[in-house]
Interface confidence: medium
């Protein structure tokens, strides 16, 4: 079975860790896809490790375990997250994850962001 | 929804310039490979070559020496040209769109060169026929 | 150039019938290998890629396994509409190479 947290949220800009978890007794995984709608962005597989779509090459990290965090998020971020766990023997196990991207605490407060970087 | 629209000269004399532009309307023009392929008569699919928004291309060995593909990103389309045609250059030609996706290393996804996983949006096709 | 063979190269079978499409490679290919299906006048369309990885948007009854030199592309259940011409695509090194192709035919 998938178990994972249906609907998460996080703030424009800042990251987020999309994770689904897998259990069962007897099937071992050999390949999981995530994708956001029908856009692939990444694959783990057993034989091969992570690989990433170039179009999120710049935002998406692999991991933790077999999860993606994606960073710089944007609004056009919000929306269906699918895990695909290939297993074997097993078949095919689906997660759905709903992401909600809200404006950041200090867009909604109506303050500037200022970042300092130091000297060097 | 991405779609790929392609036009181009059906009839050519042997010797001839096969040309054939690719539109793409939708989607991200940036982030995927463009690839030509095409397809003889009653016969299997043949990869000519794909190239990048940046202009880098890759060609089958079998037909480098008569082959351009170039890209225009300001139209969102790309280019096939196949010198001194011959009848066996008679097919069906389509323009795709490849996803490739990056072998990743740690912390950078470049160290590998990427890898195809599928050509999941393709034109229509253009029947071109080398005749005397 | 990496040679891909499929067998068989046609096939007929009846409308609920369970069929195997095998797909070999002359070296090994890991898992980056994809399968697609063409009708008669039709560009092709990708079902499967990375060996077991549908495609959004095909059905479940396609399923694709197999990994290094050899692959199969399953379809559990033949419905009117799978009957088309099924070829295996390797995508580890170009030129990217294609196998001669299935044709699939109504028994």
């Known amino acids: 079975t998938i178990d994972t947290k249906r609907n998460i949220s996080a703030e424009e800009g800042g990251s987020v860790i999309l994770q689904c978890h897998f259990s069962s007794d007897t099937a071992e995984v050999t390949q999981v896809d995530w994708k956001q709608q029908d856009q692939l962005l990444a694959i783990y597989s057993v034989d091969l490790g992570w690989h990433v779509a170039s179009v999120f090459s710049d935002r998406v990290v692999p991991g933790p375990s077999l999860g993606l965090t994606f960073q710089s998020l944007t609004m056009n971020d919000t929306g269906e997250y699918f895990c695909t766990y290939h297993t074997y023997p097993g078949g095919i196990y689906k997660g759905r994850i709903f992401l909600k991207v809200q404006e950041s605490s200090d867009d909604r407060n109506g303050l500037a962001q200022f970042q300092t970087a130091p000297l060097g | 929804q991405v779609q790929l629209q392609q036009w181009g000269a059906g009839l050519l004399k042997p010797s001839e310039t096969l040309s054939l532009t690719c539109a793409v309307y939708?989607?991200?023009?940036?982030?995927?490979?463009w690839t030509w392929i095409r397809q003889a008569p009653g016969k299997g699919l043949e990869w000519i070559g794909e190239?990048?928004?940046?202009?880098?291309?890759d060609y089958n060995p079998s037909l480098k020496s008569r082959v351009t593909i170039s890209v225009d990103t300001s139209k969102n389309q790309f280019s096939l040209k196949l010198r001194s045609v011959t009848a066996a250059d008679t097919a069906v030609y389509y323009c795709?769109?490849?996803?490739?996706?990056?072998?990743?290393?740690?912390?950078?996804?470049?160290?590998?060169?990427?890898?195809?996983?599928?050509?999941?949006?393709w034109g229509q096709g253009t029947t071109v026929t080398v005749s005397s | 150039d990496i040679q891909m063979t499929q067998s068989p190269s046609s096939l007929s079978a009846s409308v609920g019938d369970r069929v195997t499409i095998t797909c070999r490679a002359s070296?090994?290919?890991?898992?980056?290998l994809n399968w697609y299906q063409q009708k008669p006048g039709k560009a092709p369309k990708l079902l499967i890629y990375?060996?077991?990885s549908l495609q959004s948007g095909v059905p479940s009854r396609f399923s694709g396994s197999g990994s290094g030199t050899d692959f199969t592309l399953t379809i559990s259940s033949l419905q009117p509409e799978d009957f088309a011409t099924y070829y295996c695509?390797?995508?580890?090194?170009?030129?990217?190479?294609f196998g001669q192709g299935t044709r699939l035919e109504i028994k």
């Open positions: 190239i990048t928004h940046s202009g880098s291309a």
């Open positions: 990375s060996a077991y």
């Open positions: 695509q390797q995508s580890y090194s170009t030129p990217i190479t």
């Open positions: 070296q090994s290919i890991s898992s980056y």
């Open positions: 795709a769109r490849g996803l490739k996706l990056f072998r990743w290393k740690k912390t950078t996804v470049t160290t590998f060169p990427p890898y195809y996983y599928g050509m999941d949006v």
């Open positions: 939708g989607g991200s023009f940036n982030d995927y490979y």
